[in-house]
């Protein structure tokens, strides 16, 4: 019969022959022959392979180095790599999460639009008219100006994006 030019899923072509790939968590020791099956061996502890493969070496698990602000989100297995994330108050500097930086704070005049996570930084937004923020914070949203009217008071000092309005008593007209 004609030697194959393509192989089925989970197989690979070698020496004009289709051999079985090694399953996730195992590496290739020797290719199959006309008489023998592919020989695979489990990955060692702290190693992994996450696909059907013909790799002769397993990959090492990622190390979530606490000195870089990292911690383990998901422990590595023979079939999956370790997933790292950042300690509370920090976020990853890249998608691979190889190191962490402190969450950004929103300056006075700006409020938090989206609180930071282990993988994304704080998103700030300027306080619109009618709102203010007088602190630098990674959590505080813009607060609405105090409504003097609902307290039976009048505005004595207008609010800004950094300060609240100042309310005061209404001037009574003398009879």
């Amino acid at each position: 019969p004609e030697p194959p030019t393509a192989c089925r899923e989970k197989q690979y072509l070698i020496n004009s022959q289709c051999c079985s790939l090694c399953q996730p968590g195992q590496k290739l020791v020797s290719d199959c022959t006309e008489f023998t099956e592919t020989e695979c061996l489990p990955c060692g502890e702290s190693e992994f392979l996450d696909t059907w493969n013909r790799e002769t070496h397993c990959h090492q698990h990622k190390y979530c180095d606490p000195n870089l602000g990292l911690r383990v989100q998901q422990k590595g297995t023979s079939e999956t790599d370790t997933i790292c994330t950042c300690e509370e108050g920090w976020h990853c500097t890249s998608e691979a999460c190889e190191s962490c930086v402190l969450h950004r704070s929103c300056s006075p005049g700006f409020g938090v639009k989206q609180i930071a996570t282990g993988v994304s930084d704080t998103i700030c937004e300027p306080c619109p008219v009618g709102f203010f923020s007088n602190v630098s914070s990674a959590f505080e949203k813009c607060h609405p100006w105090t409504s003097c009217e609902t307290k039976d008071l009048v505005v004595q000092q207008a609010g800004t994006n950094k300060t609240d309005v100042v309310c005061g008593p209404q001037d009574r007209l003398r009879a």
């Epitope: 489990p42 060692g44 702290s46 383990v72 989100q73 590595g76 023979s78 999956t80």
Partner: antibody
Framework: EVQLVESGGGLVKPGGSLRLSCAAS????????MHWVRQAPGKGLEWVAY????????YYADTVKGRFTISRDNAKNSLYLQMNSLRAEDTAVYYC????????????WGQGTLVTVSS | DIVMTQSPDSLAVSLGEKVTINCKSS????????????LTWHQQKPGQPPKLLIY???TRESGVPDRFSGSGSGTDFTLTISSLQAEDVAVYYC?????????FGGGTKVEIK
């Protein structure tokens, strides 16, 4: 037969130090990750530290971080736990346990060694 | 940290009766890559070290009698002893094997009524 034998426990004063050892036999020590787990008298289990088969990866519980150091010597089939700045709350039986590269679970435990921190 | 909550704290059951121990984790123990739940059960008999009983939620360790079974997924797990034997008197611990720090449930003491 897999065997893990802990030693080095004893009575120590608060602020003192102790070095625990775990002698492994009956398996290829350098192929396994290792853990220390402790158990205070009459209490449950508390994970302390982990070291990977090749020494590359080390993790600690927050309660011991900066005070305890896990290490291993694959040539001597031995695991160690250096314990400094000991506190009364570190009083416990300390177990070493191995982790294989398949289950990723602690599949064998030693008999434990008792550490007592008291003045 | 993942908090593991076991219930009940203790129970006394007659020989041959069924035992059910529950374990709840504060977050999912499902590994997104291989779809396995990394929940482990250990058995600790009086005066002995713990012994691995079940890993990946439901896979019995070699040599563990088939009266022991594990089930569950995500955050809710169960250990069942189908017919309690005298040698099953022990404290049973569930354990998060999904992430560091590894965390244990408070334990469930099983006694004979």
């Amino acid at each position: 037969e897999v065997q893990l034998v802990e030693s080095g426990g004893g009575l120590v004063k608060p602020g003192g130090s102790l070095r625990l050892s775990c002698a492994a036999s009956g398996f290829t020590f350098s192929d396994y990750g290792m853990h220390w787990v402790r158990q205070a008298p009459g209490k449950g289990l508390e994970w302390v530290a982990y070291i990977s088969s090749g020494n590359r990866i080390i993790y600690y519980a927050d309660t011991v971080k900066g005070r305890f150091t896990i290490s291993r010597d694959n040539a001597k089939n031995s695991l160690y736990l250096q314990m400094n700045s000991l506190r009364a709350e570190d009083t416990a039986v300390y177990y070493c346990a191995r982790q294989d590269g398949y289950r990723y679970a602690m599949d064998y435990w030693g008999q434990g060694t008792l550490v007592t921190v008291s003045s | 940290d993942i908090v593991m909550t076991q219930s009940p704290d203790s129970l006394a059951v007659s020989l041959g009766e069924k035992v059910t121990i529950n374990c709840k984790s504060s977050q999912s123990l499902l590994n997104s890559g291989n779809q396995k739940n990394y929940l482990t059960w250990h058995q600790q008999k009086p005066g002995q070290p713990p012994k691995l009983l079940i890993y990946w939620t439901s896979t019995r360790e070699s040599g563990v009698p088939d009266r022991f079974s594990g089930s569950g997924s995500g955050t809710d797990f169960t250990l069942t002893i189908s017919s309690l034997q005298a040698e099953d008197v022990a404290v049973y611990y569930c354990q998060n094997d999904y992430t560091y720090p590894l965390t244990f449930g408070g334990g469930t003491k099983v006694e004979i009524k």
